[in-house]
Interface confidence: low
């Protein structure tokens, strides 16, 4: 069953290469287990950036080496992607799955265009 997922259209990464955005889903049921996946779409290629499964009311747990962190509050997930560089500019899509209990629901957002601008190198000072 399809589920609506909302996310901002555009986000500008900080000078330190950090971008944050909220992914909100319209839950049709009382899910206890939710999976959130961030996908990056660039040049018609879609790759998985990170994914986390969490129990409602608990923190999101990404893999230790993940570039993502996040917190959840109700039907909102606050996602932060770190270590971004200019070449990482692209459309970041939020995918939410209500894993448990059945029935399974899947929602895919329209994507957040994240713009990353590499900071200008500091001029050498004598």
């Amino acid at each position: 069953k399809a589920m609506h997922v909302a996310q901002p259209a555009v986000v500008l990464a900080s000078s330190r290469g950090i971008a944050s955005f909220v992914c909100e889903y319209a839950s049709p049921g009382k899910a206890t287990e939710v999976r959130v996946t961030v996908l990056r779409q660039a040049d018609s290629q879609v790759t998985e950036v990170c994914a986390a499964t969490y129990m409602m009311g608990n923190e999101l747990t990404f893999l230790d080496d993940s570039i993502c962190t996040g917190t959840s509050s109700g039907n909102q997930v606050n996602l932060t992607i770190q270590g971004l560089r200019a070449m990482d500019t692209g459309l970041y899509i939020c995918k939410v799955e209500l894993m448990y209990p059945p029935p399974y629901y899947l929602g895919i957002g329209n994507g957040t265009q994240i713009y990353v601008i590499d900071p200008e190198p500091c001029p050498d000072s004598d």
Partner: antibody, heavy 122, light 107 residues
Framework: EVQLVESGGGLVQPGGSLRLSCAAS????????MSWVRQAPGKGLEWVAT????????SYPDSVKGRFTISRDNSKNTLYLQMNSLRAEDTAVYYC???????????????WGQGTLVTVSA | DIQMTQSPSFLSASVGDRVTITCRAG??????LAWYQQKPGKAPKLLIY???TLAEGVPSRFSGSGSGTEFTLTISSLQPEDFATYYC?????????FGGGTKLEIK
Amino acid sequence: EVQLVESGGGLVQPGGSLRLSCAASGFTFSSYTMSWVRQAPGKGLEWVATISRGGGYTSYPDSVKGRFTISRDNSKNTLYLQMNSLRAEDTAVYYCAREDYGSSYVHWFAYWGQGTLVTVSA
Amino acid sequence: DIQMTQSPSFLSASVGDRVTITCRAGENIYSYLAWYQQKPGKAPKLLIYNARTLAEGVPSRFSGSGSGTEFTLTISSLQPEDFATYYCQHHYGSPRTFGGGTKLEIK
């Protein structure tokens, strides 16, 4: 080796009831969502019911909702399907199926039993 | 419910042939599609899930492709044991529905 063995099929009159069983072995039964899928003679496959790992949550298509009840006994590694108010169109081979999950955790039917035939006829 | 349409319904081919079966979804199901093989009097057997991932123990002559609404199952070189009926099934949420089947017969 995963094994699913259905039983309980047979001939029943329209309006009657039947209870199917599926004995599971070769895996940790309580760790998997389970389902029933049916196939009318010479026809395609139709999902009938799904039950969560602990048995607290169930799901049905509209065609059987309110008439069929899926349940499980994890202590006995057994899945059940209670079928009431049976109709001629419920005549089919009923398969018990174990669900599996990929990286995205979407469900498909990874293992199937051999099936048990239910015939609803006067 | 998402309607799944398979074509052709019947297909005649010879051992060694390359065959392709098509499955169309009534709406976008991304890559959430499975393929099953069923022989007469037997239970279905999972071949492919997530549109292109081969299930354990399935020969590499089977392959799946597609996304969105159009999917294909290809058998690169038919073997005698491949003559069977093939079903597609979306696993994009509930209720999961199957295609009508494609019966692959010996020419």
